[in-house]
């Protein structure tokens, strides 16, 4: 037999099909010009010493073969003895190690068999009613195709599916969408309506994420508040990476999961913008405010479930940084200014109440006064901090109040509202004899003592009603008792107590009269 012809004899090897899983596969045969044809196939397994034979049977009952040697591609003309206008069946037999391995048969009319291409360009992937929709442009001059897909997950083998007939400039396919695992898809095409035409090669992998992006499993920690009133949010644990099928490992466009950080500043609700979304890789600095932090995972199908954490407010207080002066027109606060043109947010809430009851006020951008102080004033009519109770005050500052991550904490402190000097007056002052020349004075704690750092000291005043002499005794804010000594028996005294703050003198309690009885010896 001539090498250019199909040899109509028994093949030069015994028929001993091994039935093994390896061997020739994916045989494709088509016309490549007006009178020339090509068949190509793939061979799986060790290639050393393998000889390939392209077998062909005609409808007349005759069969022939081409010897391809070690090649996996063979061309022949319409004069090679193979009927090109009638149906033939072709397959490859590979002879190696005293056994043959067969490819599946393809049955076709060679003349009408055109080499079809797989989808070549961009394959658009979208979600449609819980399914995956793939769409691509039909390769040039190849309108009219049958399309198949195959898909696999990281843990499952290829599964074959059918896209049905296509007859347009764009082709599409509906495929199953997995809820929680990534998939790799490949597509192939063949001529529509041409019995037994060969399938194209498989397309490049299309990598598809799961419908639900993986829930982020991350942990955060927050550093201590620095001198600049900011603290860094750090990521303790990176989100787990999505497991990918074999063909999607490495560069797998389409399966990317993006993690975004959504910050919600709970403090200072009167500011313009309360939330900000950032890339997870860019960890922000935060003020000492309370925040909710959500990590949102999303893929090309949209966002998934998010994970939310609460970052409590930094409650470290600065007892001396804030000066408050109360005048007839109202109240003014002074604190060390941060910089030029700063916007301040002053937030206050009654101590012991839910954080949701915080009130705040935003100042216009202000420069420091000549003493380097920033100020905030309010009138009595405004009702701000007007009740006689303890308030927790936090002042935040920002040169760019519209940018959530640029706020810093200036100070946090406590303030007793309303008429603190009167409200703080100690009650239930009592005097008990202590010795022949001393008494013990006790009183109930001032309301100011409920406000950390506000009560500077108690002052106890003792007045000798005879000589009109007055003595004053400072007492630590944590004490509610003092011993007055050097008193004379039979003399009338009055005692009063007041509670002072750093910037206010308290109001004296009601005078309490007492005397030490003269001891009569028997």
């Amino acid at each position: 037999c001539r090498t250019s012809e199909c040899c109509f004899q028994d093949p030069p090897y015994p028929d001993a099909d091994s039935g093994s899983a390896s061997g020739p596969r994916d045989l494709r045969c088509y016309r490549i010009s007006s009178d020339r044809y090509e068949c190509s196939w793939q061979y799986e397994g060790p290639t050393a010493g393998v000889s390939h034979f392209l077998r062909c049977c005609l409808s007349s009952g005759r069969c022939c073969y081409f010897a391809a040697g070690s090649a996996t591609r063979l061309q022949f003309s319409d004069q090679a003895g193979v009927s090109v206008l009638y149906t033939v069946t072709l397959w490859v037999e590979s002879w190696a190690r005293n056994q043959t391995e067969k490819s599946p048969e393809v049955t076709l009319q060679l003349y009408n068999s055109v080499k079809y291409e797989p989808p070549l360009g961009d394959i658009k992937v979208s979600k449609l009613a819980g399914q995956l929709r793939m769409e691509w442009e039909t390769p040039d001059n190849q309108v009219g195709a049958e399309v198949q897909f195959r898909h696999r997950t990281p843990s499952s083998p290829w599964k074959l599916g059918d896209c049905g007939p296509q007859d347009d400039d764009t082709e599409s396919c509906l495929c199953p969408l997995e809820m929680n695992v990534a998939q790799e898809f490949q597509l192939r095409r063949r001529q529509l309506g041409s019995q037994g035409s060969s399938w194209s090669k498989w397309s490049s992998p299309v990598c598809v994420p799961p419908e639900n992006p993986p829930q982020p499993q991350v942990r955060f920690s927050v550093e201590q508040l620095g001198q600049d009133g900011r603290r860094r949010l750090t990521l303790k644990e990176q989100p787990t990476q999505l497991e990918l099928p074999e063909g999607c490992q490495g560069l797998a466009p389409g399966t990317e999961v993006t993690y975004r950080l959504q910050l919600h500043m709970l403090s200072c609700p009167c500011k313009a913008k309360a939330t900000r979304t950032l890339h997870l890789g860019k960890m922000p600095y935060l003020s000492g405010a309370a925040y909710n932090v959500a990590v949102i995972s999303s893929n090309q199908f949209g966002p998934g479930l998010n994970q939310t954490w609460h970052i409590p407010a930094d409650t470290h207080t600065e007892p001396v940084a804030l000066n408050i002066s109360v005048g007839t027109n109202g109240t003014t606060m002074y604190w060390p200014a941060r910089a030029q043109s700063m916007t301040y947010c002053i937030e206050w809430q009654p101590v012991g109440q839910d954080g949701g009851l915080a009130t705040c006020s935003l100042t216009a951008p202000q420069d420091p006064d000549p003493a380097g102080m920033a100020t905030y004033s309010w009138s009595r009519e405004s009702g701000a901090m007007g009740q006689e109770k303890c308030y927790y005050i936090t002042i935040f500052a920002s040169a760019h109040p519209e940018k959530l991550t640029l706020w810093s904490t200036v100070l946090s402190t406590y303030h007793f509202g309303g008429n603190a000097s009167a409200a703080g007056t100690p009650h239930h002052v009592s005097v008990k004899n202590h010795s022949l020349d001393s008494v013990s004075v006790d009183w109930a704690p001032s309301l100011l003592s409920t406000c950390p750092g506000v009560l500077k000291e108690y002052v106890v005043r003792c007045r000798d009603e005879d000589s009109k002499q007055v003595s004053e005794h400072p007492v630590q804010p944590t004490e509610t008792q003092v011993t007055l000594s050097g008193l004379r028996a039979g003399v009338a005294y009055t005692v009063q107590v007041r509670a002072d703050t750093a910037w206010l003198r308290g109001v004296w309690s009601q005078p309490q009269r007492f005397s030490i009885e003269v001891q009569v010896s028997d």
Epitope: P11, R55, C57, C63, E105, T107
Partner: nanobody, 126 residues
Framework: EVQLVESGGGLVQAGGSLRLSCAAS????????MAWFRQAPGKEREFVAG????????HYVDSVKGRFTISRDNGKNTVYLQMNSLKSEDTAVYYC???????????????????WGQGTQVTVSS
């Protein structure tokens, strides 16, 4: 030992249908082209239908074209003959045969076949 065992024959009225099966054992079934032959009393054994090893090509004698269908299932090592619109002249013993697919995949004469079954009787009554 190679065995081809036919089944599915029987008595049927004209115009009726039967499906014959031939189960192969002792050979690598997918290496073989398969065929059905029949032999009526006092006549030569004649070719009815043939099929390539992968099922891609089929061939029928003119008298059964459009009425009979040959098919195979290589997973089950079985070849079938679906017979519809049966006529009294279809009465015969039906044999299945196998041949290696060398330079031919069917022969119209029995001498081209390597293995044979024992046959199954089909009787069509008018």
């Amino acid at each position: 030992e190679v065995q081809l065992v036919e089944s599915g024959g029987g008595l049927v009225q004209a115009g009726g249908s039967l499906r014959l099966s031939c189960a192969a054992s002792g050979l690598t079934f997918r290496n073989y082209a398969m065929a059905w032959f029949r032999q009526a009393p006092g006549k030569e054994r004649e070719f009815v239908a043939g099929i390539t090893w992968g099922g891609g090509l089929t061939h029928y004698v003119d008298s059964v074209k459009g009425r009979f269908t040959i098919s195979r299932d290589n997973g089950k090592n079985t070849v079938y003959l679906q017979m519809n619109s049966l006529k009294s002249e279809d009465t015969a013993v039906y044999y299945c045969a196998g041949k290696t697919q060398g330079s031919t995949w069917y022969h119209l004469t029995p001498d081209g076949y390597d293995y044979w079954g024992q046959g199954t009787q089909v009787t069509v009554s008018s």
